[in-house]
Interface confidence: low
């Protein structure tokens, strides 16, 4: 059961540089969670969503043909993917194949809190889940070709909840 596992919160800062705007817009994403099998480490990079596939937006990253446009001057980048249609492991592994340093998966149910993802065997790539609202917020900038930088840092270790009777 997800609630009975310990998990680590992720402290996420997002910086958006809109054209024509002097100072960048920065905001914090609360309630992010590291995946169970993710390294609990800090990472920074430019956020990228997959390229369209067959004329349709690809938010899920489940298709074997999923591709990312990685600018040649970018050393570290973070994949933004929506939850659903395939396992967390598949999504994370596909982004890792394209040399992402981290994957941020946003939920696919607006009222639901992030879960602690399980994705054994994905190696060194950092994996975090955020709410659907925040994920779509970031995606809206990417769809306008606006550069988005993200820093993910380790927050608090949350111990497993004790479900014993009488507590």
């Amino acid at each position: 059961d997800n609630a009975s596992q310990e998990y680590y919160t992720a402290l996420i800062n997002v910086t958006v540089q809109e054209p024509g705007r002097g100072a960048p817009l920065t905001f914090r994403i609360d309630r992010g969670r590291y995946g169970l099998d993710s390294p609990k480490a800090e990472v920074r990079g430019q956020v990228l969503a997959p390229l369209p596939l067959h004329g349709v937006a690809d938010h899920l990253g489940c298709d074997p043909q999923t591709r990312f446009f990685v600018p040649p001057n970018i050393k570290q980048w973070i994949a933004l993917l929506q939850r659903g249609n395939c396992t967390f492991k598949e999504k994370i592994s596909r982004a890792a194949f394209h040399n992402a340093v981290a994957v941020v998966i946003y939920n696919n149910k607006s009222k639901e809190e992030p879960v602690t993802m399980t994705h054994p065997g994905t190696g060194d790539i950092i994996a975090v889940m955020i709410t659907e609202l925040r994920g779509k917020d970031i995606l809206s900038y990417l769809e306008k070709n606006i550069s988005v930088q993200m820093t993910i840092a380790v927050g608090t270790r949350m111990p497993p909840k004790n479900f014993s009777r009488g507590s």
């Epitope: 004329g55 990312f68 040399n99 070709n145």
Partner: nanobody
Framework: QVQLQESGGGLVQAGGSLRLSCAAS????????MGWYRQAPGKEREFVAS???????YYADSVKGRFTISRDNAKNTVYLQMNSLKPEDTAVYYC????????????WGQGTQVTVSS
């Protein structure tokens, strides 16, 4: 196999403009990145600009504000509008098509010479 044909190079005075074109033919899968690189005499080939299918654009710092990359997906063609040219822009300009995310460009054009005189 993909063929790339560049055109539009030539001799221009400093401060002038040129527009390069690159048409891709052959087997073109749906979504790919097109870009321009250049190689000056005695130097390594360097990135100039690139554009994704969805028109996300990226530029080398040395050409930002002077060069504009665009593309016509229907014609499988990419353009490089070069304004305020400088002598240091002199080079052979190569078009490239990338079908993957890591800039291992599989296909290159033959190149077009751009010479900027002072």
């Amino acid at each position: 196999q993909v063929q790339l044909q560049e055109s539009g190079g030539g001799l221009v005075q400093a401060g002038g403009s040129l527009r390069l074109s690159c048409a891709a033919s052959g087997y073109i899968s749906g979504y790919y990145v097109m870009g321009w690189y250049r190689q000056a005499p005695g130097k390594e080939r360097e990135f100039v600009a690139s554009i994704s299918y969805g028109a996300s654009t990226y530029y080398a710092d040395s050409v930002k504000g002077r060069f504009t990359i665009s593309r016509d997906n229907a014609k499988n063609t990419v353009y490089l509008q070069m304004n305020s040219l400088k002598p240091e822009d002199t080079a052979v300009y190569y078009c490239a098509v990338d079908f993957d995310s890591n800039y291992a460009h599989t296909y290159w054009g033959q190149g077009t010479q751009v010479t900027v005189s002072s």
